[in-house]
């Protein structure tokens, strides 16, 4: 699986999850998030050669098409597969609010 | 929606579905498919600026991050959203077989 366990440990050029830390204030301008200050959002990148973690029949077809027609611009793209939520603390006035934001952390990738 | 209705009618630079005809024999080397000879598989391409048809909170966050940090390599990617099946005819010996291959045709795209 193209997940953090595999990808963060290996120098993988093809589609894999990459570590990316995002600071809410500095990187997003979100000053309203009190805790955490930032988090590992991660991202997916890298080429999608034929059959690499293909998401659908279409991505398999497109991967093969791209292999046989390397000059073509059509190819599958490396995108998030499994995502996890992130719990944040923010304030409404002086009242603390805890909320779980869904699909915030990429845990694995696929070729789509 | 970034679907064929919109994308095929407009000169859209950002993420959109693009027409792509695939000939089974010539483009894939699949000589076993008898009918059709080929089909419009289509594909997704184009930049994913902030908030453009964002698939998840993560893609929204990544889009904003990329806007504020344009030198960063992390950005959402334009990939298939809705796919449709394709019915094909092939032969096993002299026996014709009709089969529906799922997720073969891209109808719309999203930024993931």
């Amino acid at each position: 699986a193209l997940d953090t366990n595999y990808c963060f440990r290996n120098l993988e050029e093809n589609c894999c999850v990459r570590p990316l830390y995002i600071d809410f204030r500095q990187d997003l301008g979100w000053k309203w998030v009190h805790e955490p200050k930032g988090y590992y959002a991660n991202f997916c990148s890298g080429p999608c050669p034929y059959l690499r973690s293909a998401d659908t029949t279409h991505s398999t077809v497109l991967g093969l098409y791209n292999t046989l027609n390397p000059e073509a611009s059509a190819s599958p793209c490396c995108v998030p597969q499994d995502l996890e939520p992130l719990t944040i603390l923010y304030y409404v006035g002086r009242t603390p609010k805890v909320e779980q934001l869904s699909n915030m952390v990429v845990k694995s990738c696929k070729c789509s | 929606a970034l679907d064929t209705n919109y994308c095929f009618r407009n000169l859209e630079e950002n993420c959109c579905v693009r027409p792509l005809y695939i000939d089974f024999r010539q483009d894939l080397g699949w000589k076993w498919v008898h009918e059709p000879k080929g089909y419009y598989a289509n594909f997704c391409s184009g930049p994913c600026p902030y908030l453009r048809s964002a698939d998840t909170t993560h893609s929204t966050v990544l889009g904003l991050y990329n806007t504020l940090n344009p030198e960063a390599s992390a950005s959402p990617c334009c990939v298939p959203q809705d796919l449709e099946p394709l019915t094909i005819l092939y032969y096993v010996g002299r026996t014709p077989k009709v089969e529906q291959l799922s997720n073969m045709v891209v109808k719309s795209c999203k930024c993931s």
Epitope: P19, Y21, R25, Q26, D27, G29, K31 | E71
Partner: antibody, heavy 120, light 107 residues
């Protein structure tokens, strides 16, 4: 180009306070964390704390909590680090540094350092 | 707090030698490690971030690797101008602790 210019050397008595300044230029001051780091003579680096000048949010090392106050003045693009109840072990060079863009807390630009000597 | 144990504390090598410094974190910091160079009388300079990414303008003889708790910093061919103290720093969680430093000298 990005520059962080710190105030000059200080000699202080034990029990007093010192306020070191760090003037930033060449980038948007309000949108990058400023960190403060301590280095005793001939010793290693020790992280003190940081401030986000955009809204004044701070984060301190527990070791310095209660004795250190980090502030920022957006109008002059200057960050300050004030250390109170000074003792001899506070004799050190104090650096301000900017958190680089697109990574966690790596520090890409540093001030020249301010030597604070605590002596009776 | 996360402890960063750096070794060796000092080393002496000849010009052209390969030099390796290690840093061990007391708990996993994923890949959130930076390496700095500090020459005598100067401020520290960032060399490596995210464990293996070379900072702008840093010569390619400097490299970093590692994940989790074990990290390595390498100078592939030591030059006279590389005489300095090198520090690792975990920037995974506050407080952002530094290793004790490694003094690199020329034989």
């Amino acid at each position: 180009q990005v520059q962080l210019v710190q105030s000059g050397a200080e000699v202080k008595k034990p029990g007093s306070s010192v306020k070191v300044s760090c003037k930033a230029s060449g980038y948007t001051f309000s949108s990058s964390w400023i960190h403060w780091v301590k280095q005793r003579p001939g010793k290693g680096l020790e992280w003190i704390g940081r401030i986000y000048p955009g809204d004044g949010d701070t984060d301190y090392s527990e070791k310095f909590q209660g004795r250190v106050t980090i502030t920022a003045d957006k109008s002059t693009s200057t960050a300050y680090m004030e250390l109170s109840s000074l003792r001899s072990e506070d004799t050190a060079v104090y650096y301000c540094a900017r958190r680089m863009i697109t990574t966690q807390a790596a520090l890409d630009y540093w001030g020249q350092g301010t030597l604070v000597t605590v002596s009776s | 707090d996360i402890q960063m144990t750096q070794s060796p504390s000092s080393l002496s090598a000849s010009v052209g030698d390969r030099v390796t410094i290690t840093c061990k974190a007391s708990q996993s910091v994923i890949n959130a490690v930076a390496w700095y160079q500090q020459k005598p009388g100067q401020s520290p300079k960032l060399l490596i971030y995210y464990a293996s990414n070379r900072y702008t303008g840093v010569p390619d003889r400097f490299s970093g690797s590692g994940y989790g708790t074990d990290f390595t910093f390498t100078i592939s061919s030591l030059q006279a101008e590389d005489v300095a103290v090198y520090y690792c720093q975990q920037d995974y969680s506050s407080p952002y602790t530094f290793g004790g430093g490694t003094k690199v000298e020329i034989k």
